[in-house]
Interface confidence: medium
């Protein structure tokens, strides 16, 4: 399917105003620095040449590669030393060393401001002198904050983001209205991006095949009835769309997953029972409800998996005929009878017996030797169960704030070289598992939980990849994808971590402590209570809780005091000598 | 969907022999049983050879044919093959290849999902 152009091709699959969008995301994701008119400018010129190619497809350039026109167009900011540093060394490579250069240089934490949302009367004053750049900008901010954002679903983010404005300024109580459907998105926006993280970490750090047995497991759960042939065409077809839009083909991604959306639309037979609602919606959401469409249900006469991968005499030779096959097929109907199951644990199972074939093909007698494969996967399974339990009842008896506190103590005393704020970060995101997964049913909290650890373990991954600190955390970032949770989990207290000097500012607070949210003043007494750890890594929890409640009646007193910045100067080192003290 | 095309019939005398292939358009092809069924005028449609997926070790015949007919598979090109030597009049019928996704093996006509066109065979006396 080759194209005299490529830019013209694309311009036309996608319409305008998608490729517009899409490649406002990429030089945004490329360069997260720039401010939003530089990058305006430089999409409007892409665009305006991309029009030229699609009234003639030999006029010249146009028959150059996607990546050479983008990068040609991104090593023309003339601000890119000052602003980037070694990233302009990028621009002196040729392609695709280039793109590859410009994907190493993007920053997983950049060095932005926090969005600060303006009053509702200001936002939809903005919304309607300009709708056009008011929408631009959005996907401006969110794209140079989340570089590996996926861009088809930025772009059905912004469409929910057009639609709260255009109800909600029309509304008698605007703030009403808009607030909650912000909260939401903003929400929604950040799980959507840690997600899409650890998919282009699969890809990158582990391969696609590492993609693929994620997809086999999760298509295999959503769509029991399809056959494996099925679901390895969709795997295939899926593989593409997220190794082009981790590798920064923003174009080349969108355009695939909607003919992968129009492909399952039109085989939906063959496919699920459940995607029938989602395909009588526009594109954006249409894709979107795909991605998240529920479980179908299991066939009602599915047999034992025993007789075909443990009993069967041909289980070495149907191996060696075709390995990735064969555990492709095992995985797929393992998952198939096991919604309920994290994808994690499948691919540990599908590891396992992986690793038992390995070692029992080569055996004297490789029957006898896989005849008790399926006990071994007992263990295995218990300890995601087990771990979902005791975590769960932990957080019923706490709460949201209390369980994160215990998980960030738990995590600090793992590995206490990694920053402060990553530390809370990581831990806060851990701790709203509880509140995500506990209340489902059974069948539905190990994968609700696993799979979601997972996300966050690998933002955690991705932000020590940036500044390396702990051995013990490489380890479990780098030896297996699927073993990192419960790499994490088995990890104790670090012996050989050197306590870190107490230092008296770190503890010391200020009037402001109390005209911060609800949400800002819990992340402030959480990175005082991850530093106290880092000072006494072996405080009993007793301690630790003794401490904290000081500390919470310590700023309540004070915010409530007439002369607040009076009482925190006289409070404040008390507090701290009583800390010592308490934690001596 | 699987598509499955059958070549090789045609007329024979008795005692002589035919190659029927039945090649399919699934990439998957390594995941499926493969049969082959025939019916002959006014009669049932019955069982005649099943190979098992991947490597296709284990094979099975019905009694009627055993000795005489092979039943074998190239993965690599996605097709089946049904060897079929010392033929007799009786073995007269079309012949249709089936693919099953159920088992990794089936004589049961009821376990494959999709069926080809078939390909007629005729032995003459």
């Known amino acids: 399917d080759t194209h005299k152009s490529e830019v013209a091709h694309r311009f036309k699959d996608l319409g305008e105003e998608h490729f517009k969008g899409l490649v406002l995301v990429a030089f945004s994701q490329y360069l997260q620095q720039c401010p939003f008119e530089e990058h305006v400018k430089l999409v409007n010129e892409v665009t305006e040449f991309a029009k030229t190619c699609v009234a003639d497809e030999s006029a010249e350039n146009c028959d150059k590669s996607l990546h050479t026109l983008f990068g040609d167009k991104l090593c023309t900011v003339a601000t890119l030393r000052e602003t980037y540093g070694e990233m302009a060394d990028c621009c002196a490579k040729q392609e695709p060393e280039r793109n590859e250069c410009f994907l190493q240089h993007k920053d997983d934490n950049p060095n932005l401001p926090p969005l600060v949302r303006p009053e509702v009367d200001v936002m939809c004053t903005a919304f309607h002198d300009n709708e056009a750049t008011f929408l631009k900008k959005y996907l401006y901010e969110v794209a140079r904050r989340h570089p590996y954002f996926y861009a088809p679903e930025l772009l059905f983010f912004a469409a929910r983001y057009k639609a709260a404005f255009a109800e909600c300024c029309q509304a008698a109580d605007k703030a009403a209205c808009l607030l909650p459907k912000l909260d939401e998105l903003r929400d929604e926006g950040k799980a959507s991006s840690a997600k899409q993280r650890l998919k282009c970490a699969s890809l990158q750090k582990f391969g696609d095949r590492a993609f693929k047995a994620w997809a086999v497991a999760r298509l295999s759960q959503k769509f029991p009835k399809a056959e494996f042939a099925e679901v390895s065409k969709l795997v295939t077809d899926l593989t593409k769309v997220h190794t082009e839009c981790c590798h920064g083909d923003l174009l080349e991604c969108a355009d695939d997953r909607a003919d992968l959306a129009k492909y399952m639309c039109e085989n939906q037979d063959s496919i699920s029972s459940k995607l029938k609602e989602c395909c009588d919606k526009p594109l954006l959401e249409k894709s979107h409800c795909l991605a998240e469409v529920e479980n179908d249900e299991m066939p009602a006469d599915l047999p034992s998996l025993a007789a075909d991968y443990v009993e069967s005499k041909d289980v070495c030779k149907n191996y060696a005929e075709a390995k990735d096959v064969f555990l492709g097929m095992f995985l797929y109907e393992y998952a198939r009878r096991h919604p309920d199951y994290s994808v994690m644990l499948l691919l540990r199972l599908a590891k396992a017996y992986e690793a038992t074939l390995e070692k029992c093909c080569a055996a004297a007698d490789p029957h006898e030797c896989y005849a008790k494969v399926f006990d071994e996967f007992q263990p295995l399974v218990e300890e995601p169960q087990n771990l979902v339990k005791q975590n769960c009842e932990l957080f019923e008896q706490l709460g949201e704030y209390k369980f994160q506190n215990a998980l960030l103590v738990r995590y600090t005393k793992k590995v206490p070289q990694v920053s402060t704020p990553t530390l809370v970060e990581v831990s806060r995101n851990l701790g709203k598992v509880g509140a995500k997964c506990c209340k489902l049913p059974e069948a539905k909290r190990m994968p609700c939980a696993e799979d979601y650890l997972s996300v966050v373990l690998n933002r955690l991954c991705v932000l020590h990849e940036k500044t390396p600190v702990s051995e013990k955390v490489t380890k479990c970032c780098t030896e297996s994808l699927v073993n990192r949770r419960p790499c994490f989990s088995a990890l104790e207290l670090d012996e050989a971590y050197v306590p870190k000097a107490f230092n008296a500012e770190t503890f010391t607070f200020h009037a402001d402590m109390c005209t911060l949210s609800e949400k800002e003043k819990q992340v402030k007494k959480q990175t005082a209570l991850v530093e106290l750890v880092k000072h006494k890594p072996k405080a009993t929890k007793e301690q630790l809780k003794g401490v904290m409640d000081n500390f919470a009646a310590f700023v309540e007193k004070c915010c409530k005091a007439d002369d607040k910045e009076a009482c925190f100067a006289e409070e404040g080192p008390k507090f701290v000598a009583a800390s010592q003290a308490a934690l001596a | 969907e699987v598509q499955l095309v059958e070549s090789g019939g045609g007329l024979v005398q008795a005692g002589g022999s035919l190659r029927l292939s039945c090649t399919a358009s699934?990439?998957?092809?390594?995941?499926?049983?493969m049969g082959w069924f025939r019916q002959a005028p006014g009669k049932e449609r019955e069982f005649v050879a099943a190979?098992?997926?991947?490597?296709?070790?284990?094979?099975d015949y019905a009694d009627s044919v055993k000795g005489r007919f092979t039943i074998s598979r190239d993965n690599a090109k996605n097709t089946v093959y049904l060897q079929m030597n010392g033929l007799k009049p009786e073995d007269t019928a079309v012949y249709v290849c089936?693919?099953?996704?159920?088992?990794?093996?089936?004589?049961?006509?009821?376990?494959?999902?999709?069926w080809g066109q078939g390909t007629q065979v005729t032995v003459s006396s």
């Open positions: 190979i098992s997926w991947f490597a296709g070790d284990t094979t």
């Open positions: 089936a693919a099953s996704s159920a088992r990794p093996m089936s004589g049961r006509s009821d376990e494959y999902h999709y």
């Open positions: 699934r990439r998957a092809f390594i995941g499926y049983a």
